[in-house]
């Protein structure tokens, strides 16, 4: 059969029915990420509490993150919410401290239960806090007389938190 002339149009162009199916470049602020498209998609605009992480091009959409003090939620950063402190989680009534037995080491997300060392047959080497999980040590059997000495692991280095950014009202 006859080949669809539009299939020859590469990404960054569209098959223009008004111009005898010529491949026309996507207009400003639009893109087509695949070939053979009959229209170009409008670029996402990172406004308000959103910030542009990657500019739109003729072949790919813009990508947003959040302005300072806010962080992304949802697929493709569909929402921005305010940061909490480490040791807290965001609830409907604002940021709340993690309950005893739980922790959050980031400015976002929920409080998670401390690791239960005993489930792995280990002891607690360092107690947990609102901001840090417990550190499990060797099992009690390893601590019996004659057992080889165990060097406790160095605490994990806390990753730095770069300021979060936001988009429009």
């Amino acid at each position: 059969g006859l080949q669809d002339p539009c299939s020859n149009c590469p990404a960054g162009t569209f098959c223009d029915n008004n111009r005898n199916q010529i491949c026309s470049p996507c207009p400003p602020n639009s893109f087509s990420s695949a070939g053979g498209q009959r229209t170009c998609d409008i670029c996402r605009q990172c406004k308000g509490v959103f910030r542009t992480r990657k500019e739109c091009s003729s072949t790919s959409n813009a990508e947003c993150d959040c302005t300072p003090g806010f962080h992304c939620l949802g697929a493709g950063c569909s929402m921005c919410e305010q940061d909490c402190k480490q040791g807290q989680e965001l609830t409907k009534k604002g940021c709340k401290d993690c309950c005893f037995g739980t922790f959050n080491d980031q400015k976002r997300g929920i409080c998670r239960p401390w690791t239960n060392c005993s489930l792995d047959g280990k002891s607690v080497l360092v107690n947990g806090t609102k901001e840090r999980d417990v550190v499990c040590g060797p099992s009690p059997a390893d601590l019996s007389p004659g057992a080889s000495s165990v060097t406790p692991p160095a605490p994990a280095r806390e990753p730095g938190h770069s300021p979060q950014d936001i988009e429009g009202r």
């Epitope: 605009q45 990172c46 406004k47 308000g48 509490v49 910030r51 542009t52 302005t67 300072p68 003090g69 806010f70 305010q82 940061d83 909490c84 402190k85 807290q88 965001l90 009534k93 604002g94 940021c95 400015k107 300021p163 950014d165 936001i166 988009e167 429009g168 009202r169």
Partner: antibody, heavy 118, light 107 residues
Amino acid sequence: QVQLQESGPGLVKPSETLSITCTVSGFSLISYGVHWVRQPPGKGLEWLGVIWSGGSTDYNPSLKSRVTISKDNSKNQVSFKLSSLTAADTAIYYCARNPLTATVMDYWGQGTLVTVSS
Amino acid sequence: DIQMTQSPSSLSASVGDRVTVTCRASQNVGTNVAWYQQKPGKAPKALIYSASYRDSGVPSRFSGSGSGTDFTLTISSVQPEDFATYYCQQYNSYPLTFGGGTKLEIK
């Protein structure tokens, strides 16, 4: 309606610590951040720092070692402290609310003039 | 830090004039720019955010435009209450920074 009101000492001596309180009404500190901005007499605006709804803080690196911002949600108050004062810290100090829609200031207090002089 | 350079630093206008203030960022800030109005002895007042969105209650004669590094605040027909100083602010990254201000005076 949304209101912010700064209260400060007016006059402080060099090397001392400035302490200003911002009392807010018409909104909850549990939901909104509060910025601090200053303006030397006859000059422009300088951002000092912010405390977010969850209590996390971000400061201007040019002053970071001297600035502390804290808050008491139950009292609707935000506290601003600036240590090791010099004459260059003489300014009107403003607190301002951050809306939920951008990192900007939508409502401002009337400001409090702080003069650093011996 | 991102520098915000405003021009002119002052300008004179008559009631009814169209006035334009510009602000240039030292690096790309997307559309993360706000504009404020400040009258003598008063606190600043928010006018525009996201380069072009008017804050609630701001008259339609105020408009903002621009993206990347160049931004404009326009007053389509200056009214007596508009004579004030105007500041731009970027909020794309910390530290938040303001322009030096543009004083709008009566001609």
